[in-house]
Interface confidence: low
C-alpha cells in the first residue's frame, strides 16, 4: 500500500533554470545539515553541508560554488537552491543530519530537469473502474480500480480512504509506466461486500495537481443486490 | 581513498528465510563506523544499524552484522524476512572528521531485495473484467505460483500495457492488465497459468443485466474529481 506522508516530493524544472528544495528533517535547529544526491544506479553522494552556527557552506571537492546554495529560513525549513540546471542534475536530493550517532535523512525530493515541451496540464487524469458483478457475487468482495494517465513527472502517491474516514486502506498498485512523454499508473482496492455500500476515495498526490492539493477521485457506493443468479460452472 | 562496494545488485528470497547482503569497503582510517540504510520505494532512507570498527558484531532486532575488519567486509543479515523488507539496502562508511556532525557518509550502490511469498500449493486464479469507456482492466486474483500470461481478447486493440503483478495480502499473487479497445464491450480476458487456461467468461454470472454492479440511484456514474 502507498505511503502518503509528507508533501509531494518532486520538482520539475526546465534546463537552464533554478530549483529550490526544502529540507524536511525531523531534527530541529541542527547545526550541520548535509545535502546528498542519489541518482539511479549510482551511490548516493554528499554535495555539501551547511554550518548554521557560522552561516557557511562547505562544499565537497569538485563541487562548483556557483551550482548550489543553501540558507535557513524559519524553524527547521532549510532551503537548497540549484542553479543553471542541466538534465544530469536530475535525481533524488536528501537533506541529512547527525542525531546521536546515526545520520537521519529527510524523505527525499526528486528533481526532474527536462528539455521536453510538455502540455500545459500534466496533472494525473483519472478514470474509475467499478467492481464486476461476477466478483461481487462469487467472492463477496469488490475491486475498485483507479487509473491515472498523462501526468509528469513520474513521482506520484496514491492511497485510498472510505468517505468520512481518515484511515488509509490497504491497496495495491502497478509500476508507473511511461507513455510517450508522460506517465500512467493504476491502483486498486478490494473491499469486502459489507463495505461496497460506502463511498470510497482514491486520493492522488502529485506536484502538478491543480492548486497543489490532493486530487480526490470519488468511487460511488454500489448496489450489490441487483443479481442473485448463480455463476456458470467452471 | 575511501570506497564502498556492494557487488549484489539484487537478491530474491522467500518470506521467513534470511538474506545476507555483502558489503566491502576500503579505508585508511584507523577508527570508523559503517551504517546500513533501507531505501523504500518512496525514496525514504531509513537507518537500520551501525557497526563500529572496534566493536563486536552489531545486532538490532532482525538485523545483524557480520563484521570482518581484516577483510574489510561488513555483511548485513536480515532474518525472518517479511514482505515489507522488499526495498533497496545501502551500506555506508562513516568518515571520521574534525567533528562527527560534519562527517559524510560514503555509500555503496545498494542491493535491491525482493521478498517473495512462501512456497505453497498451486492455486488457480479468478479472472474478472472491468470496463469504463474504451478502457478495459483484467483483474486476476489469488494465484500461485507467479508465472502467468494475461491476454485481453479483442479484434480492435488501441493499446495495451504490461501487467502489474503484486503480492496479495494473503501471500499469493494478484495481477491487473489494462488496455484500450474500440470494442470494449466484447473484450474478454484469458489467462495461462500452471499449464491451464482460465477465462473471465468462466466467472460471469447468468443474467440479462450488464456485467457491472450498479451505483446507488443517487450517485453519479461519471468520474468526479475534486481538485
Amino acid at each position: 500500500s502507498s505511503n502518503l506522508e509528507g508533501r509531494t516530493k518532486s520538482v520539475t524544472r526546465p534546463t537552464g533554470s533554478s530549483a529550490v528544495i526544502t529540507c524536511d528533517l525531523p531534527v530541529e535547529n541542527a547545526v550541520y545539515t548535509h545535502w546528498y544526491l542519489h541518482q539511479e544506479g549510482k551511490a548516493p553522494q554528499r554535495l555539501l553541508y551547511y554550518d548554521s552556527y557560522n552561516s557557511r557552506v562547505v562544499l565537497e571537492s569538485g563541487i562548483s560554488r556557483e551550482k548550489y546554495h543553501t540558507y535557513a529560513s524559519t524553524g527547521k525549513s532549510l532551503k537548497f537552491i540549484l542553479e543553471n540546471l542541466i538534465e544530469r542534475d536530475s535525481g533524488v536530493y536528501y537533506c541529512a543530519t547527525w542525531d546521536w550517532g546515526k545520520k537521519l535523512f529527510g524523505s527525499g525530493t526528486t528533481l526532474v530537469v527536462t528539455d521536453k515541451q510538455l502540455d500545459a496540464d500534466v496533472s494525473p487524469k483519472p478514470t474509475i473502474f467499478l467492481p464486476s458483478i461476477a466478483e461481487t457475487k462469487l467472492q463477496k468482495a469488490g475491486t475498485y480500480l483507479c487509473l491515472l494517465e498523462k501526468f509528469f513527472p513520474d513521482v506520484i502517491k496514491i492511497h485510498w480512504q472510505e468517505k468520512k474516514s481518515n484511515t488509509i486502506l490497504g491497496s495495491q498498485e502497478g509500476n508507473t509506466m511511461k507513455t510517450n512523454d508522460t506517465y500512467m499508473k493504476f491502483s486498486w482496492l478490494t473491499v469486502p461486500e459489507k463495505s461496497l455500500d460506502k463511498e470510497h476515495r482514491c486520493i492522488v498526490r502529485h506536484e502538478n495537481n491543480k492548486n497543489g492539493v490532493d486530487q480526490e477521485i470519488i468511487f460511488p457506493p454500489i448496489k450489490t443486490d441487483v443479481i442473485t443468479m448463480d455463476p456458470k460452472d467452471n | 581513498a575511501q570506497k564502498v562496494t556492494q557487488a549484489q545488485s539484487s537478491v530474491s528470497m522467500p518470506v521467513r528465510k534470511a538474506v545476507t547482503l555483502n558489503c566491502l569497503y576500503e579505508t585508511s582510517w584507523w577508527s570508523y563506523y559503517i551504517f546500513w540504510y533501507k531505501q523504500l520505494p518512496s525514496k525514504e532512507m531509513i537507518f537500520l544499524i551501525r557497526q563500529g570498527s572496534d566493536e563486536q558484531n552489531a545486532k538490532s532486532g532482525r538485523y545483524s552484522v557480520n563484521f570482518k575488519k581484516a577483510a574489510k567486509s561488513v555483511a548485513l543479515t536480515i532474518s525472518a524476512l517479511q514482505l515489507e523488507d522488499s526495498a533497496k539496502y545501502f551500506c555506508a562508511l562513516g568518515e571520521p572528521n574534525h567533528f562527527l556532525n560534519t562527517d559524510k557518509l560514503i555509500f555503496g550502490k545498494g542491493t535491491r531485495v525482493t521478498v517473495e511469498p512462501r512456497s505453497q500449493p498451486h492455486t488457480k486464479p479468478s479472472v474478472f473484467v472491468m470496463k469504463n469507456g474504451t478502457n478495459v482492466a483484467c483483474l486476476v486474483k489469488e494465484f500461485y505460483p507467479k508465472d502467468i500470461r494475461i491476454n485481453l481478447v479483442s479484434s480492435k486493440k488501441i493499446t495495451e500495457f504490461d501487467p502489474a503483478i503484486v503480492i496479495s495480502p494473503s501471500g499469493k499473487y494478484n495481477a491487473v492488465k489494462l488496455g484500450k479497445y474500440e470494442d470494449s464491450n466484447s473484450v474478454t480476458c484469458s489467462v495461462q497459468h500452471d499449464n491451464k487456461t482460465v477465462h473471465s467468461t468462466d466467472f460471469e454470472v447468468k443474467t440479462d443485466s450488464t456485467d457491472h454492479v450498479k451505483p446507488k440511484e443517487t450517485e453519479n456514474t461519471k468520474q468526479p474529481s475534486k481538485s
Epitope: N29, T97, D99 | G52, H98
Partner: antibody, heavy 130, light 107 residues
Framework: EVQLVESGGGLVQPGGSLRLSCAAS????????IHWVRQAPGKGLEWVAS????????YYADSVKGRFTISADTSKNTAYLQMNSLRAEDTAVYYC???????????????????????WGQGTLVTVSS | DIQMTQSPSSLSASVGDRVTITCRAS??????VAWYQQKPGKAPKLLIY???SLYSGVPSRFSGSRSGTDFTLTISSLQPEDFATYYC?????????FGQGTKVEIK
C-alpha cells in the same frame, strides 16, 4: 554543580585487571561524552579512551586498544574503564573528564562535536608492579 | 595520528613578563585546539578552547591564537599563580593528542 569522582585505582601485578569508576553529578552522562586521560609519574598527559554513552560510540588509544574497555551505566550516571592485561607502562594517575560544549545548539544537534575538557576528576592512581 | 609538538619544554620568567608557548600540529586540526594549565598533584584546568576562545572564569591575561597549524598561548603579564605546566591538546580528530607540556618556572 558539575563534579567527577574517580575510584578503583590501586596496586596490581602485571597481567592483572582493575576497573576504574567515574561517578558524575551535576549533569547526565547520557547527554554528554566521558573521556579518560592518564598521566604517568613526571610525564605529560595521554588520552586513553572516550565514550558517547547515548549511542555507544567508543574510541581508544592504540596503546590500550584490545586491553581496556570504556563503558557507562546511565542509570548510575557513572562511566567505567575496565583495564585488563595491565603492564608496567600503564602506571599513571587516571583522570576522567567531561567535554565543554560552548554553543547553544549542542543539545539540538545531538551533541556529536568533539570538545575540549572543562571538568576533570581529582584522579586515581594505578600502579602496575610486581 | 596528529602530533602536537610543543615548545619550549620549559622556560624561566619573572612576574609581569609576557610569556608565549607554541604548539605545532603535524596536520590540519581546524581550530579544535585547547590549552590547559596543571599544577603538581592537581587535575588540568581548561584555559582556552577552539584555539582562541577564553574559557569562562579564566583571567583575560591568557589568550590563544592560530596561524595555520601553529597555535600559540600567550600570558600577557605573568602572575605568581601562573607558575605551572601548560599543555596544548587537539581534539578535532581521534586519537586526541596532547603536546609534551611546557613548565613555566620562576626565574
Amino acid at each position: 554543580e558539575v563534579q567527577l569522582v574517580e575510584s578503583g585505582g590501586g596496586l596490581v601485578q602485571p597481567g592483572g585487571s582493575l576497573r576504574l569508576s567515574c561517578a558524575a553529578s551535576g549533569f547526565t552522562v547520557s547527554s554528554s561524552s566521558i573521556h579518560w586521560v592518564r598521566q604517568a609519574p613526571g610525564k605529560g598527559l595521554e588520552w586513553v579512551a572516550s565514550i558517547y554513552s547515548s549511542s555507544g560510540y567508543t574510541y581508544y588509544a592504540d596503546s590500550v586498544k584490545g586491553r581496556f574497555t570504556i563503558s557507562a551505566d546511565t542509570s548510575k550516571n557513572t562511566a567505567y574503564l575496565q583495564m585488563n592485561s595491565l603492564r608496567a607502562e600503564d602506571t599513571a594517575v587516571y583522570y576522567c573528564a567531561r567535554p565543554y560544549y560552548w554553543y547553544p545548539y549542542y543539545y539540538w544537534s545531538g551533541g556529536w562535536e568533539y570538545a575540549a575538557f572543562d571538568y576533570w576528576g581529582q584522579g586515581t592512581l594505578v600502579t602496575v608492579s610486581s | 595520528d596528529i602530533q602536537m609538538t610543543q615548545s619550549p619544554s620549559s622556560l624561566s620568567a619573572s612576574v609581569g613578563d609576557r610569556v608565549t608557548i607554541t604548539c605545532r600540529a603535524s596536520q590540519s586540526v581546524s581550530s579544535a585546539v585547547a590549552w590547559y594549565q596543571q599544577k603538581p598533584g592537581k587535575a588540568p584546568k581548561l584555559l582556552i578552547y577552539s584555539a582562541s576562545s577564553l574559557y569562562s572564569g579564566v583571567p583575560s591575561r591568557f589568550s590563544g591564537s592560530r596561524s595555520g597549524t601553529d597555535f600559540t598561548l600567550t600570558i600577557s603579564s605573568l602572575q605568581p599563580e601562573d607558575f605551572a605546566t601548560y599543555y596544548c591538546q587537539q581534539y578535532g580528530e581521534y586519537p586526541i593528542t596532547f603536546g609534551q607540556g611546557t613548565k613555566v618556572e620562576i626565574k
